[in-house]
Amino acid sequence: KKEDGESTAPTARPKVLRCKCHHHCPEDSVNNICSTDGYCFTMIEEDDSGTPVVTSGCLGLEGSDFQCRDTPIPHQRRSIECCTERNECNKDLHPTLPPLKDRDFVDGPIHHK
């Protein structure tokens, strides 16, 4: 989801935005800081063993609107938050995993109907 009531259509920023990156640092990042024309993000998702993993970084403007929308994916617990209001704003994002549905207990992460 987007923070601070941003509109859904991404608009070009006049200046570069710096974001904290963790587990998601591109080659052009320095000291765990990446640069973007789009958004900073923090995401939490379950790995294959069901352990919550937090990643953060930069999303380019192209496609970021879709990525920040946080559409539910079947059989995948994941949540993402995006921000642009200041540099390293994603330090203050704390997305939480959506609650487990009953169906998820039955299916497990690898069984598909």
Epitope: K15, E27, D28, V30, I33, S35, T36, C58, G60, N87
Partner: antibody, heavy 116, light 112 residues
Framework: QVQLQQPGPEFVKPGASVKLSCKAS????????VQWVKQRPGQGLEWIGE????????LYNQNFKGKATLTVDTSSSTAYMQLSSLTSEDSAVYYC?????????WGQGTTLTVSS | DVVMTQTPLSLPVSLGEQASISCRSS???????????LHWYLQKPGQSPKLLIY???NRFSGVPDRFSGSGSGTDFTLKISRVEAEDLGVYFC?????????FGSGTKLEIK
């Protein structure tokens, strides 16, 4: 029109500090970063660092950490660079510049001479 | 740090001739957003640099169309199709993909 005004030459003694200014006009000051660049004769251009006036966020070239300190006063749309413990190596022209994703406008530069 | 190597260091040309300046970077300048932040500036004697070309090939406002930029990855070129007297000065390439941002050492365009 976009302008970055820098004062005339500065003459300082070795060991002293100096605070260079850069007054921006013709655009929204907080919408762009301000960068500082050093130019010594025959030594090309050297990026010192940059500051985002909207949140005072700074990035420095490692070579200038401890030497340069960047600040802004948004009420007067002015950026500052303080240089400390000056030596003859710091004698140069110092430019401020507006930066979005690239530098599009430069100040006219302030010539700093460090000499006893 | 990314090293920007410009050639030639000096370029003597006749007025009306074409001039070409090369800039090579020690690593790719393609940013993770897909943009390539390679730019060209002209510095005339006693003046501050002026932006000519941004992001490889985009002419800045007011820059004559005799200036053009091209290239990709690590290899870039600035071309002036017909050199005029007002084009004389030192040309710099610059990258803003990697921190710290770096500049080429400059190419001095002078009259032959």
């Amino acid at each position: 029109q976009v302008q970055l005004q820098q004062p005339g030459p500065e003459f300082v003694k070795p060991g002293a500090s100096v605070k260079l200014s850069c007054k921006a006009s013709g655009y929204t000051f907080t919408s762009y970063w301000v960068q500082w660049v050093k130019q010594r004769p025959g030594q090309g251009l050297e990026w010192i660092g940059e500051i985002d006036p909207s949140d005072n966020y700074t990035l420095y070239n490692q070579n200038f950490k401890g030497k340069a300190t960047l600040t802004v006063d948004t009420s007067s749309s002015t950026a500052y660079m303080q240089l400390s413990s000056l030596t003859s190596e710091d004698s140069a022209v110092y430019y401020c510049a507006r930066f979005g994703f690239y530098v599009d406008y430069w100040g006219q530069g302030t010539t700093l001479t460090v000499s006893s | 740090d990314v090293v920007m190597t410009q050639t030639p260091l000096s370029l003597p040309v006749s007025l009306g001739e074409q001039a070409s300046i090369s800039c090579r970077s020690s690593q790719s300048l393609v940013h993770s957003t897909g943009n390539t932040y390679l730019h060209w500036y002209l510095q005339k004697p006693g003046q501050s640099p002026k932006l000519l070309i941004y992001k490889v090939s985009n002419r800045f406002s007011g820059v004559p169309d005799r200036f053009s930029g091209s290239g990709s990855g690590t290899d870039f070129t600035l071309k002036i199709s017909r050199v005029e007297a007002e084009d004389l000065g030192v040309y710099f390439c610059s990258q803003s993909t990697h921190v710290p941002f770096t500049f080429g050492s400059g190419t001095k365009l002078e009259i032959k």
